[in-house]
């Protein structure tokens, strides 16, 4: 049993090392954003025992604009592209450690994860408070406005290709 690509988080990317059950992965915030104190970048692949379907727990991560950083706009393709940031203290919870990801729950359903349709892109996640789709103006790998810039990187033992069609890539780009 494996998980589909994890849901998108606004202003964050994710590189999935393993889609296996109980794998734990971390999102990272885009340049110019920082993790809001008290939120967690962790997500875990868990099993919904009621449906016997694996899914990722919903991360509490919020990537917020960091006023201490000079946020550069996406640069046009060029010979050399550099996006640097200025020093700033890390955003940590009062305990000084990042809170753990929300506990796996057997009653979590696909409604809290990305809906995957074979041969399609990763569907946008919904805002818990409004039910509306969160939109980010960040540039995607394809140079088009995207839902977020979250992408999944699958860790493989070597550079050999995985069997085709095992997992959707999980781009959160919407066109």
């Amino acid at each position: 049993i494996t998980c589909p690509p994890p849901m998108s988080v606004e202003h964050a990317d994710i590189w999935v090392k393993s889609y296996s059950l109980y794998s734990r992965e971390r999102y990272i915030c885009n340049s110019g954003f920082k993790r809001k104190a008290g939120t967690s970048s962790l997500t875990e692949c868990v099993l919904n025992k009621a449906t016997n379907v694996a899914h990722w727990t919903t991360p509490s991560l919020k990537c917020i604009r960091d006023p201490a950083l000079v946020h550069q706009r996406p640069a046009p393709p060029s010979t050399v592209t550099t996006a640097g940031v200025t020093p700033q203290p890390e955003s940590l919870s009062p305990s000084g450690k990042e809170p753990a990801a929300s506990s796996p729950s057997s009653n979590n359903t696909a409604a809290t994860t990305a809906a995957i349709v074979p041969g399609s892109q990763l569907m946008p996640s919904k805002s818990p408070s409004t039910g509306t789709t969160e939109i980010s103006s960040h540039e995607s790998s394809h140079g088009t406005p995207s839902q977020t810039t979250a992408k999944n990187w699958e860790l493989t033992a070597s550079a050999s290709h995985q069997p085709p069609g095992v997992y959707p890539q999980g781009h959160s780009d919407t066109t």
């Epitope: 399609s120 960040h138 790998s141 997992y167």
Partner: nanobody
């Protein structure tokens, strides 16, 4: 098939700087998303920074924000990781990674062989 070769690792004192380079071959470099990962002894391989194929979006893990900068030179088929204000906890093997962006299917991550970075106190 994508081949990646890292360089620039070494021993440096805390507070110092290093610049890692990763040369890619085997595919059009400008079509690749690139990233740097690191793995400390006994720990998992973690994402450090990433840059998309156009160079328009970069991301950093919390602990390196403001200290590390990822960049790419498409003319030289090379991605860089400028590491400033290094700390002992940055000690790890650093891996270059590449991926062909795909919206519909899984694509493998291509890995370099890694380069050791050791920060002494």
């Amino acid at each position: 098939e994508v081949q990646l070769v890292e360089s620039g690792g070494g021993l440096v004192q805390a507070g110092g700087s290093l610049r890692l380079s990763c040369a890619a071959s085997g595919r059009t470099f400008s079509s690749l998303d690139m990233a740097w990962f690191r793995q400390a002894p006994g720990k998992e391989r973690d994402t450090v920074a990433s840059i998309n194929s156009s160079g328009g979006t970069t991301s950093y893990t919390d602990s390196v924000q403001g200290r590390f900068t990822i960049s790419r030179d498409n003319a030289k088929n090379t991605v860089y990781l400028q590491m400033n204000s290094l700390k002992p906890e940055d000690t790890a093997v650093y891996y270059c990674a590449a991926r062909v962006p795909s919206a519909v299917s899984a694509t493998p991550i291509y890995w370099g062989q890694g380069t050791q970075v050791t920060v002494s106190s």
